[in-house]
Structure formats: C-alpha cells, structure tokens
Interface confidence: low
Amino acid sequence: GITNINCSGHIWVEPATIFKMGMNISIYCQAAIKNCQPRKLHFYKNGIKERFQITRINKTTARLWYKNFLEPHASMYCTAECPKHFQETLICGKDISSGYPPDIPDEVTCVIYEYSGNMTCTWNAGKLTYIDTKYVVHVKSLETEEEQQYLTSSYINISTDSLQGGKKYLVWVQAANALGMEESKQLQIHLDDIVIPSAAVISRAETINATVPKTIIYWDSQTTIEKVSCEMRYKATTNQTWNVKEFDTNFTYVQQSEFYLEPNIKYVFQVRCQETGKRYWQPWSSLFFHKTPETVPQVTSKAFQHDTWNSGLTVASISTGHLTSDNRGDIG
C-alpha cells in the first residue's frame, strides 16, 4: 500500500487518519529532501492531483483542506518540485479512511440449530460504519460466573462444548472501531430454550381424485425433540397472501397433512417448526410446488422443472426445492 513507500518527509492528517465521515480535514505535507528547497508542493488523492484548497505554510510544509469529506477510503501522497529536478520528488503517502462510530448492537439473538454443535449468535449492527469494526461477544455463565469473550467481525458460532458453566448465560455484544465503542443490552438465555429443531422438509405431495379432490402433503424432520409445533403455509403461485395451518407434531413418523384445493392451479408450500412453547422458529423450508389436476391426475417433478402427466388415480409432486428469500422476521 501507499504506507509502505520510502518517505523523504512526512504526511499527516488532522484530526486523524481515520475520521468521522463528513468532517472537514486537513492533510499536511512536510518535505525533507536533501539539497531541495521545494518550489511547490503537490497533493494527490487516488493518483489524481488536487488543484484547490492548498496552502503553503512555510518553505517545507503545505496543507490541503477538504470540506465535508465523504469518501470511505482514499490514498493520499504528496510530492515536491525541486530546482534542477525534471520530475516531482515523492515525499510521503498515507491511506485515510472516513466512517462512523458503531451503533449500539441490538436484537441480539442466540440459537442452537439441532445437531449443529454450535450456538449461533447474531445481532443488528446498525448503520454501515465504512471502517473496520470488530465485535466482542461476551458469554457469562449465571451459574459459575465464568465469562468468555469471542472476537468477530460479524456473527459468531460458539461451540456448545465450550459452554460448560451450566445452561443459563448472559450474552452481550460490544462493537468497536477507531471512532467509538458501544455495548448492547444483555440477553439472558437458557440453552434448552434456544434449540431450533432439525429442518422440516416437504418430500412429496399427491392429490387423491375422490368426489372432493384432496391433496396430501408429506413432510418430515430428523429432530429428536418430542414436542414440536409446526406451521405450513401455502398459496396459489398467482396469489400474494399465504394461508397458514398449524400442527402439533410428533416426528416418529412422516407427517401427512390434508388440503382441499382448487383444481388446475399451481400451489406453493412451505413448512417451519419450533420446539413447542419456545421462542425461535426454523426458517421457512424450501419452496415446494404442486399443481392440482383438472380431471386427469398429473405428476409434477421439480427436479425437471416441468409438468408430466400420469394416468393413475393420484397426482403426486416431488421437489428438490430451492431456497426462499422470504425469511425475514422468522427468527425472533
């Protein structure tokens, strides 16, 4: 970088090399070149020579002034015009950064995805800081008072093996960068209350061609949690509004849920579960598509992304699915 060059003088920034975005800043350049009384001092930002707001302070020093500096990063260097030199002589360079102090981290959330072996803690970091911001996640046992700290630049996965101080913890997050430090409120957690069951997956669907056609959705989870509550939402692909059905579930066998749907319409289904009475839900499962038959049953295979027809009495769908982006607000 620009900071690694051999200097024949000194460049510095006031109030600091890293400063709050929108501030007025001054960049000073002082030449110390043998046998050179600089005729002129020049400033370059990202390789482009600056023309305005340059003030000569004395024989060896000049100042460049910026009003309302808004660039997150810039490489600055300055040069001197020396008598008897055809080229400008490089004096020194510096990388400067502007940004914001961190906001107070909020919405601290910790969950354990079943079988993951980790407690995953996330938070809302607030507005973009533009500069290097680190987070320290503090985990303090309420039983043993042992405190562990984890440094990260985003979320953190904490091995459940390291959580040996009982099941009750306080978790809080400190955000820090060159411009400031903030600390979240403390979140009290009980490890048994933050487990999210192993993902529920819709495996297939079939429409039984009875007097009133009935669609059965087959779905399952590998969870070992005994009491699980689930929601299945569904809608016609042309609709905006979801219908939601709730289930108390025992995953000792594959679940079968029945729906009475309109004929000849493509529907989309998703499922999510939580441990009954707990706070956190799984994200919604992959989108599962199923088209109901007109009169002749059909098979829909998501694996091939097209509809095939079948002359049997039932219409079935299987799905490899794809991830939905509609997961906002599902955890919390």
């Epitope: 039983e143 008072e145 562990q148 091995s159 390291s162 040996q164 101080g165 048994d192």
Partner: antibody
C-alpha cells in the same frame, strides 16, 4: 458407559507435591467440565473447584487458591489435581466428578484417591 | 457462601419404616425455574452416588422409595420403605451459585 478412574493412594511427607489423575471414558472429554472435591476423614465434602475441559481454564474456591492446581491432558481424556507444599491437613480423599451442565449435580464420580500427608 | 445445615446428624430406622432427612440452606437455592438442591448417598469406601437432583427428580436407576421435596431454603429427602442396603450417609448439596457447598451429612442406621 461413563467412567472416571482415578490414580491410586499416595503417602507423602509435608512440603512434597502430589499429582492425582482422573481418566474419563464413555463420553467426549472436552464437552463437560471436571470438578474436584475433597473429603477429609470424619468430615463433610468440600468443593475445590473445576476446570473447563474445552478452554483449560481452572476455577478454584477461595479455600483452595494457591497450592492446588488443575490441569488437563486432553489427548488422554485425563484431568489432574496437583497439590504442592503438602500439609498434614491436606490428608483427605480427593474425588474428581462430572457435573451435569443443566443441574450442577455431580452425576458421575471417580472412586477417590486417598492422600496421606505424614512425616 | 451458602451454608447447608443437615438434620439430624444421625438416625436409626426400622426396616420398612420411613426415614426423613432435612437440609436447610442459609439462603434460597431456588429460581423461578428450578430448585438447585441435590441429594447423595455414600457408603464406606465408595464415592457418593447421586439420588435426587433439582430437589425432586429421581436419578436414573435409583429406586422409587427415594423421594425429594422442598423449595427455597428447606428441603427433605424421604426413604420409604427403608431397606437394609439403605444404611449409609446422606448428603445434600446446592448448585445455585459458586461455591457449591455440601451439608455435613446424616448417617442412617438400621435398628
């Protein structure tokens, strides 16, 4: 099944050092803290403290700070209690124990190691 | 530190009768969720054996004649009907905070 097997009895002179081992089996050693408990003859149990088997961080109760030290040999699933500068009042049976993270109850115990300090 | 006071220090009970052992904590060992009180049995030359955890939960493999009750500061271990193999010393222990402390023990003998 879960087992904690401790080293055999020790006879030491005052001022010497003793190191007791506790080998764990039947579970993943680094997932549960190891506790140490003292039982003096004719007296009750005193909790010495515990060591976090994942981070290696020891915690001692006030009565046992200084001469008592916990350590680990994770590759051998073994925890150690070392007592230095032994005194006659250290004569006791020392137990390692595995506590339940949820309850704090000592669900599994080693068989105990009798340390006798006598000149 | 929380001081655990057990009573009686010893008791003699006839086979088939009820044995009741009390343990009082110097301050509450209960939260809104649990009572962090546990009971152990120790026989000579053996390590302690967990009988009851969280005041009233029977540890796996422990006979149903052992039961625990109580909350806050006062807890009780009951054995009924007492059998010959129950002759031992019984200890209470809390895990509400650090340090974890034990009662002085109650020696149960058979008449």
């Amino acid at each position: 099944q879960i087992q904690l097997v401790q080293s055999g009895p020790e006879l030491k002179k005052p001022g010497e050092t003793v190191k007791i081992s506790c080998k764990a089996s039947g579970y993943t050693f680094t997932t549960v803290g190891m506790q140490w408990v003292q039982k003096m003859p004719g007296k009750g149990f005193k909790w010495i403290g515990w060591i976090n088997t994942h981070s290696g961080e020891p915690k001692y109760t006030d009565d046992f700070k200084g001469r008592f030290a916990f350590s680990l040999e994770t590759s051998a699933s073994t925890a150690y209690l070392q007592i230095s500068n032994l005194k006659s009042e250290d004569t006791a049976t020392y137990f390692c124990a595995r506590s339940s993270a949820l309850t704090g109850a000592f669900a599994y115990w080693g068989q105990g190691t009798l340390v006798t300090v006598s000149s | 530190d929380i001081k655990m006071t057990q009573s009686p220090a010893s008791l003699a009970v006839s086979l088939g009768q009820r044995a009741t052992i009390s343990c009082r904590a110097s301050k509450s060992v209960s939260t809104s969720d649990y009572s962090y009180m546990h009971w152990y049995q120790q026989k000579p030359g053996q390590p302690p054996k967990l009988l009851i955890y969280l005041a009233s939960n029977l540890e796996s493999g422990v006979p149903a004649r052992f039961s625990g009750s109580g909350s806050g500061t006062d807890f009780t271990l009951n054995i009924h009907p007492v059998e010959e193999e129950d002759a031992a010393t019984y200890y209470c222990q809390h895990s509400r905070e650090l340090p974890r402390t034990f009662g002085a023990g109650t020696k149960l003998e058979l008449k």
